[in-house]
């Protein structure tokens, strides 16, 4: 296992329907055939997958039917989507990066983007 | 190194707007937000609200709500805040200051004074 | 919105003596996202702690922070001449980010 840089924006404000995109970008040493990205969570401590995609150079990045999240790739970088936020799911989404194939297998893990999530206020009550 | 650089003090009449400028340098900007804080004469600190400056997205305080815009331009990293229909109790040091999340650098201030 | 309490509202001791600041938040947020700021008179507040215990670039070993869910404290061991000055504690884990009302650390 060969260690690999991952860069991400540190901060950043999610927009009021609860959708948040950042560019995670890998310096890839090599020509990547497959490569797989993982969004982690780390919320006091505590590391979850948000969610995972392979996908091959050239190739749209296919997450499961009910992921969350959404991607696209350009050469080395993987616009990241993640909607349907809440504010109770602000905290630290850590970006993974694994080139799968050929060998040798690279892993890169960046240092995270803190994502912030507000909840719309309620809307007045009206008598229409 | 990383350093805010704001614009100089300003005075102003009830009523009117004033917008303060931010100058970022020694960083990549659009990697973190831009908050800003004031200080009243002998009070403590108010935030105001943050902007994400790799998006635009912005978070005001419900008190500014509708009377604040804070703005930037990447192509000049520096970020903008505009406060309008200023009253005398607005007068206060307004700081800039990058959200790493934490405030971990700030500018010197700037001070803004409402008088007739 | 995490409203922040800080305590006491004056501490006056003498250099060399340790000080003690207490910060209670209204409710429970992530313990990661607490600072705390130091503001001299006429100068921009500097960030002294962040994640509630790690120190900020620069900041002498003698500032140290503890605590998590509710209750904060920032410890100075012995107090300098140039540790005189306002102290405010920060959360930065929600939005709206919110400061304590701070704690005046002067010379008895």
């Known amino acids: 296992c060969k260690a690999m840089h991952v860069a991400q924006p540190a901060v950043v404000l999610a927009s009021s329907r609860g959708i948040a995109s950042f560019v995670c970008e890998y310096a890839s040493p090599g020509k990547a055939t497959e490569v797989r990205v993982t969004v982690l969570r780390q919320a006091d401590s505590q590391v979850t997958e948000v969610c995972a995609a392979t996908y091959m150079m050239g190739n749209e990045l296919t997450f499961l039917d009910d992921s969350i999240c959404t991607g696209t790739s350009s050469g080395n970088q993987v616009n990241l989507t993640i909607q349907g936020l809440r504010a109770m799911d602000t905290g630290l989404y850590i970006c993974k990066v694994e080139l799968m194939y050929p060998p040798p297998y690279y892993l890169g893990i960046g240092n995270g983007t803190q994502i912030y999530v507000i909840d719309p206020e309620p809307c007045p009550d009206s008598d229409f | 190194q990383v350093q805010l650089v704001q614009s100089g003090a300003e005075v102003k009449k009830p009523g009117a707007s004033v917008k303060v400028s931010c100058k970022a340098s020694g960083y990549t900007f659009t990697s973190y937000g831009i908050t800003w804080v004031r200080q009243a004469p002998g009070q403590g600190l108010e935030w105001m609200g943050w902007i994400s400056a790799y998006n635009g997205n912005t978070h005001y305080a419900q008190k500014f709500q509708g009377r604040v815009t804070m703005t930037t331009d990447t192509s000049t990293t520096t970020a903008y805040m505009e406060l309008r229909s200023l009253r005398s109790d607005d007068t206060a040091v307004y700081y800039c200051?990058?959200?790493?999340?934490?405030?971990?650098?700030w500018g010197q201030g700037a001070l803004v004074t409402v008088s007739s | 919105e995490i409203v922040l309490t800080q305590s006491p509202g004056t501490l006056s001791l003498s250099p060399g003596e340790r000080a003690t600041l207490s910060c209670r938040a209204s409710q429970s947020g992530s313990s990661s996202y607490l600072a705390w700021y130091q503001q001299k008179p006429g100068q921009a507040p500097r960030l002294l702690i962040y994640?509630?215990?790690s120190r900020a670039t620069g900041i002498p070993d003698r500032f140290s922070g503890s605590g998590s869910g509710t209750d904060f404290t920032l410890t100075i061991s012995r107090l300098e001449p140039e540790d005189f000055a306002v102290y405010y504690c920060q959360q930065y884990g929600s939005s709206p980010f919110t400061f304590g009302p701070g704690t005046k650390v002067d010379i008895k």
């Open positions: 200051a990058r959200v790493g999340p934490s405030f971990d650098y």
């Open positions: 994640g509630a215990s």
